[in-house]
């Protein structure tokens, strides 16, 4: 590590005196920074000597010496004060530039350490500092404004008390630059707009930025619009607002509107679409099929999408029958707005009962008139089966009635022994009825079909089973001939 003679760390001299600073190291040494013309610099073996024959207040500063060959990069420093009774300050720079929230060093160096107790920092012409200016002072370096703010970018003077009066330095201009994180923030409202020809409309493009240097414009398709700009300062940001007001819109006003703002960091834009229509409109649609089938006991949500302008004046869900005069509970109806002109209406039908099958209609109204969208809801049921023994035209006949939805198909089975249900191993014979007779087929109701099995003689040690099946499930009924007639029963649950 190099060594400076005199040993310091401070040296106080009077103006006009000769000052010699010698730096000695193991190898070659050099003085840091630009050396002013007032100094003479010469080398003497492993030492470097700075000398001046006429010290002035401008020589006040810290002198640092380094040894370039030293792997530890050591240095030595001495601070020289040239105490001039007329010049308490040596200002090293007249302008300082920092970014906001950085510490700003105002390099006014005190020429006499004795004056330290009476120093202060003021704005130009002795004005007090801005409120909450947090600063500290170092006689070697000057005043530090901590975490400088944009509005603290001012002209400052360093003040020292000498013989009961304040002596000011020349001024130092501090420029505090805002840290611009990116392009200005933008809003364009509304996000979309629909108007009937002849109505009024307003589109507002606003941009905000951390500093005042930014531009904003509103453009229609590819045309830049000439709109007066309103400026404001709010929440520590600069705002610029462009408002396009149209008294009576026409089709030429329709199209794409872009709000564009730019600053040193770049450009940011956002767009919206303005639609001009001839008259009010109201469109209802659904992503669902309007004919719905649901298994009894399950739930269903009916969803309708509405596109409308002007807004809806009324809407409701109605049950149109055919089973009862009940109406959907309002709590089961839900409305959500996707955006200004599009809405979704949902009717929740939980745990559907047989009496809730039928037609459900969503009705909506706006100045364009009424519109309705109707869903047809059919419930699916697993088949219910019953078998009876009857005589038709003198012939013994097994008559199987199956009821369900969708329409059940019917299969007869004959199996050995008496059983509630034929299993595969016992089956002796299978008859599939390709065309059972439809007894009833009303909308939204179960379909009832009938199948006949004609048997001249029924074998007593056999079971005859009617099975019905549809997409929901299956049902069956077993018939066991007995000597005293016949008995029928459904299988055990």
């Amino acid at each position: 590590i190099p060594v400076i003679e005199p040993s310091g760390p401070e040296l106080v001299v009077k103006p006009g005196e000769t000052v010699t600073l010698r730096c000695v190291g193991n190898g070659s040494v050099e003085w840091d920074g630009p050396i002013s013309p007032h100094w003479t610099l010469y080398s003497d073996g492993p030492s470097s000597v700075l000398t001046t024959n006429n010290a002035t207040f401008q020589n006040t500063r810290t002198y640092r010496c380094t040894e370039p060959g030293d792997p530890l990069g050591g240095s030595a420093a001495i601070h020289l004060y040239v105490k001039d009774p007329a010049r308490p300050w040596n200002v090293l720079a007249k302008e300082v530039v920092v970014f906001e929230d950085q510490d700003a060093l105002l390099p006014c160096l005190l020429t006499d350490p004795v004056l330290e107790a009476g120093v202060s920092l003021v704005r130009l012409r002795g004005r007090p500092l801005l409120r909450h200016t947090n600063y500290s002072f170092s006689p070697w370096h000057g005043f530090i404004i901590h975490r400088a703010k944009f509005i603290q970018g001012q002209d400052y003077q360093c003040s020292a008390l000498m013989g009961g009066r304040k002596v000011m330095s020349i001024s130092i201009r501090l420029k505090v630059q805002k840290v611009i994180p990116g392009p200005p923030a933008l809003t364009l409202v509304p996000a979309e707009l629909v108007r009937i020809r002849g109505e009024a409309a307003q589109i507002v493009c606003s941009a905000s930025n951390i500093d005042v240097d930014f531009d904003v414009f509103l453009q229609h398709n590819t045309t830049k619009l000439a709109i007066p700009q309103r400026s404001d300062f709010h929440d520590n940001r600069y705002q610029k607002v462009l408002t396009l007001s149209l008294g009576q819109v026409d089709f030429q006003h329709a199209g794409n509107y872009s709000c564009v703002a730019s600053n040193v960091q770049g450009k940011h834009s956002t767009s919206m679409f303005f639609q001009v229509v001839e008259s009010a409109y109201l469109d209802l649609s659904s992503e669902q099929n309007l004919i719905q089938e649901v298994t009894v006991g399950e739930g269903l949500n009916l969803k309708v999408m509405v596109e409308a302008y002007p807004g809806l004046q009324g809407f409701n869900w109605t049950y149109l029958g055919p089973f009862s005069d009940h109406q959907p509970e309002p709590k089961l109806a839900n409305a959500t707005t996707k955006d200004t002109y599009r809405h979704t209406f949902t009717l929740s039908l939980p745990r559907l009962k047989p009496s809730e099958a039928g037609r459900y209609s969503f009705l909506a109204r706006n100045p364009g008139g009424w519109r309705a969208l109707t869903f047809e809801l059919t419930l699916r049921y697993p088949p219910e089966v019953s078998v009876i023994w009857t005589s038709i035209n003198g012939s013994g006949t097994l008559l199987c009635a199956a009821s369900g939805y969708p329409q059940p198909n019917v299969t007869w089975l004959q199996c050995a022994g008496h059983t509630d249900r034929c299993d595969e191993a016992q089956v002796l014979q299978v008859w599939v009825d390709p065309h059972p007779e439809v007894l009833s087929q009303e909308p939204f109701q179960k379909v009832t079909v009938q199948s006949l099995l004609t048997a001249e003689t029924l074998e007593h040690n056999q079971t005859y089973e009617c099975r019905a099946h549809n997409s929901v499930g299956s049902g069956s009924w077993a018939f066991i001939p007995i000597s005293a007639g016949a008995r029928t029963h459904p299988p055990d649950e």
Partner: antibody, heavy 120, light 111 residues
Amino acid sequence: QVQLQQSGAELMKPGASVKISCKATGYTFSSYWIEWVKQRPGHGLEWIGEILPGSGSTNYNEKFKGKATFTADTSSNTAYMQLNSLTSEDSAVYYCARNYDGSLYPMDYWGQGTSVTVSS
Amino acid sequence: DIVLTQSPASLAVSLGQRATISCRTSESVSIHGTHLMHWYQQKPGQPPKLLIYAASNLESGVPARFSGSGSETDFTLNIHPVEEEDAATYFCQQSIEDPPTFGGGTKLEIK
């Protein structure tokens, strides 16, 4: 929500000292200055000074140096102002108010005020 | 210290009309386009309530009938249309340098 709750009214003898408290809730106490303001009928509003609870930094109006002393307890989010050597001139309503760090900012929330009456 | 002079000291305004209060400062309180002037409303027995900050910015929750304008040394508070509940004393305050100072107040009466 931000609230500043001040201690109750005080009736004091001349020459005595009084300590007024201001309890802050609803914001980060250490990050905002607590301002103290005096109001006397016919004298308007006068700024006494301020304290930044996080650092203990204080600034006093020259006029009130030696009269007022500010302290703050960050564990209880409470700021205090002590007024000493009371005279009839100190009879007033004293307010605490919150102020963010920087010239840009106003005193956005105020306590309800503490009335101090100095009478023999 | 910066001196703030408010005028008038009192005024009476009819319901629904405009009230205009002026505040003049002994030094400029504007810096880099920011005006360090704030307005407060005070009703009897209550603390001051912030209405406008940085000359023209409406504090959250304050009705839009209050507005502020001005720069450098001349500032104005406008209330339009005046409502019954606006009867109060209004103060301006500068925050550019210590000590912060207040205007003497303007008492608004509703006719």
